[in-house]
């Protein structure tokens, strides 16, 4: 920290200039007062100083605003956003969307940092649920954001947020996270005839419960094998060769290089034999002829 | 994307020197550069300064009269020219750029070494 000392007769600052990056750290503490640098905070960007200088500014700030900046102030902070600490934007009340743009383009071409997730966090919660125009910022910025969130926050995404979601945003995502995105999907997309509402249900499908492949499975919609392989285990199983034949289209010949990996080779194995043979694509592994199947789990429902 | 520094040497004192500083990965346009030093167990402080168009330029007291700052866009570099060379001029001169088209990058280079000694 800067001790405090007089500032020296004539150098006291009129505007925030070029002119600063040629005072020592102690003159800046003495001679810039706190409120002119918040209403010239946008100058600062233009200005080359150095990473010590702009301590001494935060620091400037810091004391005129102890409970946290306006938001007049954060959406001029350019390159000091990245002297911000969490615990610094945990005070901060930032509602306006060109606010959030302004400090992440800031950060734009690094890894999301802890203050960028703060900020972020902050953000959402001020506006009480992830809306089209923020998702579609966030996205643009970090396209595996949606994916960093978990289920209970994937939660509060209204269903027309999701016309924001590219097929990116969604490669780092688990089936927990898919399972609540999933209906969400659905239901913004329900009023779109067949092929285009596959074609923006698709990157969703590792979310989709049997009934809803078996409804697929009926409209022709030739899923390619990268699709299949991340739907759920548990929803490919009860699915019929009949089913999968007409849901893979012509892509159904890429079952025989898949069937050692799930969910491919747990299908297999629920299939009987003659079933599979009439793929003519030699998977082996299905109930052998004259088998007798008991599903122990509808027995249970049922006693 | 950086800055990379150049020119930097031993002189004599009332010697010249000229220091580059080029831009890599980006243009340098649309950033004002400043020219700063840092002697050994000081402060880094400002030296010079220039505005993206060229047009406005600054120098700290020390070095007024003496060092002259110039820009070449085509070139994608900036220039600072030493002469009358000081003993207490001697430190390590690193460039910084600010500003930028969406007016919120900085690069910062290495810096090279100068010394003035007899």
């Known amino acids: 920290e800067v001790e405090k000392t007089a500032c020296p007769s004539g150098k006291k600052a009129r505007e925030i200039d070029e002119s600063l990056i040629f005072y020592k750290k102690w003159e800046l503490e003495a001679c810039v007062d706190a409120a002119l640098l918040a209403t010239q905070m946008d100058r600062v960007n233009a200005i080359p100083f150095t990473y010590e200088q702009l301590d001494v500014l935060k620091h400037k700030l810091d004391e005129l605003y102890p409970q946290g900046y306006p938001e007049s102030v954060i959406q001029h902070l350019g390159y000091l956003f990245l002297k911000m600490s969490p615990e610094d934007i945990r005070k901060w009340n930032v509602t306006s969307l060109e606010t959030l743009k302004a400090l992440l383009e800031v950060n734009k071409g690094h890894e999301m940092s802890p203050q960028v997730a703060t900020l972020i966090d902050r953000f959402v919660k001020g506006r009480g649920q992830l809306d089209k125009d923020t998702l579609d910022t966030l996205t643009a910025f970090y396209p595996g954001y949606l994916c960093s969130l978990s289920p209970e926050e994937l939660s509060s995404v209204p269903p027309s947020s999701i016309w924001a979601v590219r097929p990116q945003d969604l490669d780092t995502c688990d089936p927990r996270q898919l399972d609540v995105l999933y209906p969400k999907a659905r239901l913004a997309f329900q009023n779109m005839n067949g092929s285009e509402y596959f074609v923006k249900i698709q990157s969703f499908l590792g979310g989709a419960p049997t009934e809803d492949l078996k409804a697929l499975s009926q409209q022709n919609v030739s899923m390619d094998l990268a699709t299949f392989m991340k739907l759920r285990t548990d929803a490919v199983l009860p699915l019929t060769v009949a089913e999968v034949q007409k849901l893979l289209g012509p892509h159904v010949e890429g079952l025989k290089a898949e069937e050692r990996h799930r969910p491919v080779r747990d299908w297999i194995l629920r299939q009987r034999q003659d079933d599979l043979d009439t793929l003519g694509l030699g998977l082996q592994g299905g109930i052998p002829n004259g088998y007798l199947v008991l599903d122990l789990s509808m027995q249970e429902a049922l006693s | 994307l950086q800055l990379v520094e150049s020119g930097g040497g031993l002189v004599q004192p009332g010697g010249s020197l000229r220091l580059s500083c080029a831009a890599s990965?980006?243009?340098?346009?649309?950033?004002?550069i400043g020219w700063f030093r840092q002697a050994p167990g000081k402060e880094r402080e400002g030296v010079s300064y220039?505005?993206?168009?060229?047009?406005?330029?600054n120098y700290a007291d020390s070095v007024k009269g003496r060092f002259t700052i110039s820009r070449d866009n085509a070139k994608n570099t900036v220039y600072l020219q030493m002469n009358s060379l000081k003993p207490e001029d001697t430190g390590v001169y690193s460039c910084?750029?600010?500003?930028?088209?969406?007016?919120?990058?900085?690069?910062w280079g290495q810096g090279t070494s100068v010394a003035v000694s007899s």
């Open positions: 910084a750029a600010a500003g930028g088209y969406g007016n919120s990058s900085r690069y």
């Open positions: 990965g980006f243009t340098l346009d649309y950033y004002a």
């Open positions: 220039i505005s993206s168009s060229g047009g406005s330029t």
